[in-house]
C-alpha cells in the first residue's frame, strides 16, 4: 500500500477543533484523489468524513460534514470541528488514488486526537 504519513498526536483546541496534515507518497500521476478520515475505537471503524478532489483543485467535503480541508500537492490539511471529550480517539487518514489507473490505497498509522471539554464558566453575581 501507498505510504501515508500523519502526526501521532494532536490536541484539540478548547473550541473542539483539531487540525493535522496527511501526506502521501504518490507512485503515479493521479488526477483524482479520495481522502477519508476514519475513527477507530477498539475493533470498530467508522467513517468521519470523506472528500474527492481533482489534483490542483480544492478539497470539498459535504456541506454537513464536520471536516474541512485544503490540498497542496501530495499533502492534505485536515480540520475536524465540533469535537467533544467523548470523541477522543484514533483518527486514521486513508488516501486513494482513484484515477487514472492503477488504483492505489494508503492508510496512515493514525493520529490520536485528545479533546478536553472546557470547564463551564462559574455564574457571577453582579
Amino acid at each position: 500500500a501507498m505510504h501515508v504519513a500523519q502526526p501521532a498526536v494532536v490536541l484539540a483546541s478548547s473550541r473542539g477543533i483539531a487540525s493535522f496534515v496527511c501526506e502521501y507518497a504518490s507512485p503515479g500521476k493521479a488526477t483524482e484523489v479520495r481522502v477519508t478520515v476514519l475513527r477507530q475505537a477498539d475493533s470498530q471503524v467508522t467513517e468521519v468524513c470523506a472528500a474527492t478532489y481533482m489534483m490542483g483543485n480544492e478539497l470539498t467535503f459535504l456541506d454537513d460534514s464536520i471536516c474541512t480541508g485544503t490540498s497542496s500537492g501530495n499533502q492534505v490539511n485536515l480540520t475536524i470541528q465540533g469535537l467533544r471529550a467523548m470523541d477522543t480517539g484514533l483518527y486514521i487518514c486513508k488516501v486513494e488514488l482513484m484515477y487514472p489507473p492503477p488504483y492505489y490505497l494508503g492508510i496512515g498509522n493514525g493520529t490520536q486526537i485528545y479533546v478536553i471539554d472546557p470547564e463551564p464558566c462559574p455564574d457571577s453575581d453582579f
Epitope: A1, L38, E96, P101, P102, Y103, Y104, L105
Partner: antibody, heavy 115, light 108 residues
C-alpha cells in the same frame, strides 16, 4: 489497448531455474507496481511477488513460499518485468500471471516442475 | 499475516437470483480489499477495488460493501455470463497480499 504478455514458461526439472518475462503496453508502465500471481492446477490464486516503481525505490516483496528462491525485477525503458525462479520445486507448478497494479492481468504462462 | 476467509466455497443459484459472497479478514483492513472475477479458462479480471468501487467495464449488477474486517460482494441479478470463480484480496501493507480461497458460482 492494455496488454501484458508473459513468456518463458515451460517444463523444468526440480532444482533447476527458469526466468519469466512480462512485456507491457498500452499503459504507463513506470507508474505501476508490478506483481506476479500464480495459480496451481485446480487451485486458487496466490500472490508471489511485487516490485514497486521509482518513487518507491523499486522496493521488492515476496511471499514466504518463494522468498530466497525467486527474484522480481523490472526494466522501465523496455516496459518489462521479470521473475527469476531458482531452486524450483514441484509445488511451484502453476500458471504465472503478471499484473500491473492489480488492475491489469496478462494471459499467463505455464510452469511445470517435474522430473 | 492477515488471513482472508471467503465463503461459501461454491454456490449454485438460478438466473435472476441475488447472490452474496463474503470475505472476512483476521484483522481490520480499512476497506483495502479487491474482488476479482475469473471465468473458466481465462485470466482473472479486477471486478471491485477499494471494497466498493466498480471496475471499468464491469456490469452494475455487481457491487461491493463492507468495512473493518467484513466485506461482501453482491450480484443483484445473476446472469449466465456470471458463471465464474470470485476471489477477494487484501491490498493493505504489509505483505503478503493474500487472496481468499475463492467462490465458484454456478447456474442451477
Amino acid at each position: 489497448e492494455v496488454q501484458l504478455v508473459e513468456s518463458g514458461g515451460g517444463l523444468v526439472q526440480p532444482g533447476r531455474s527458469l526466468r519469466l518475462s512480462c512485456t507491457a503496453s498500452g499503459f504507463t508502465f513506470s507508474d505501476n507496481w508490478m506483481n506476479w500471481v500464480r495459480q496451481a492446477p485446480g487451485k486458487g490464486l496466490e500472490w508471489v511477488a511485487q516490485i514497486r516503481n521509482k518513487p518507491y525505490n523499486y522496493e521488492t516483496y515476496y511471499s514466504d513460499s518463494v522468498k530466497g528462491r525467486f527474484t522480481i525485477s523490472r526494466d522501465d525503458s523496455k516496459s518489462i518485468v521479470y521473475l527469476q525462479m531458482n531452486s524450483l520445486k514441484t509445488e511451484d507448478t502453476a500458471v504465472y500471471y503478471c499484473t500491473g497494479g492489480m488492475d491489469y492481468w496478462g494471459q499467463g504462462t505455464t510452469v511445470t516442475v517435474s522430473s | 499475516d492477515i488471513q482472508m476467509t471467503q465463503s461459501p466455497s461454491s454456490l449454485s443459484a438460478s438466473v435472476g437470483d441475488r447472490v452474496t459472497i463474503t470475505c472476512g479478514a483476521s484483522e481490520i483492513i480499512y476497506g483495502a480489499l479487491n474482488w476479482y472475477q475469473q471465468k473458466p479458462g481465462k485470466s482473472p479480471k479486477l471486478l471491485i477495488y477499494g471494497a466498493t468501487n466498480l471496475a471499468d467495464g464491469m456490469p452494475s449488477r455487481f457491487s461491493g460493501s463492507g468495512s473493518g474486517r467484513d466485506y461482501t460482494l453482491t450480484i443483484s441479478s445473476l446472469q449466465p455470463e456470471d458463471v465464474a470463480t470470485y476471489y477477494c484480496q487484501k491490498i493493505l501493507s504489509p505483505p503478503p497480499w493474500t487472496f481468499g480461497g475463492g467462490t465458484k458460482v454456478e447456474i442451477k
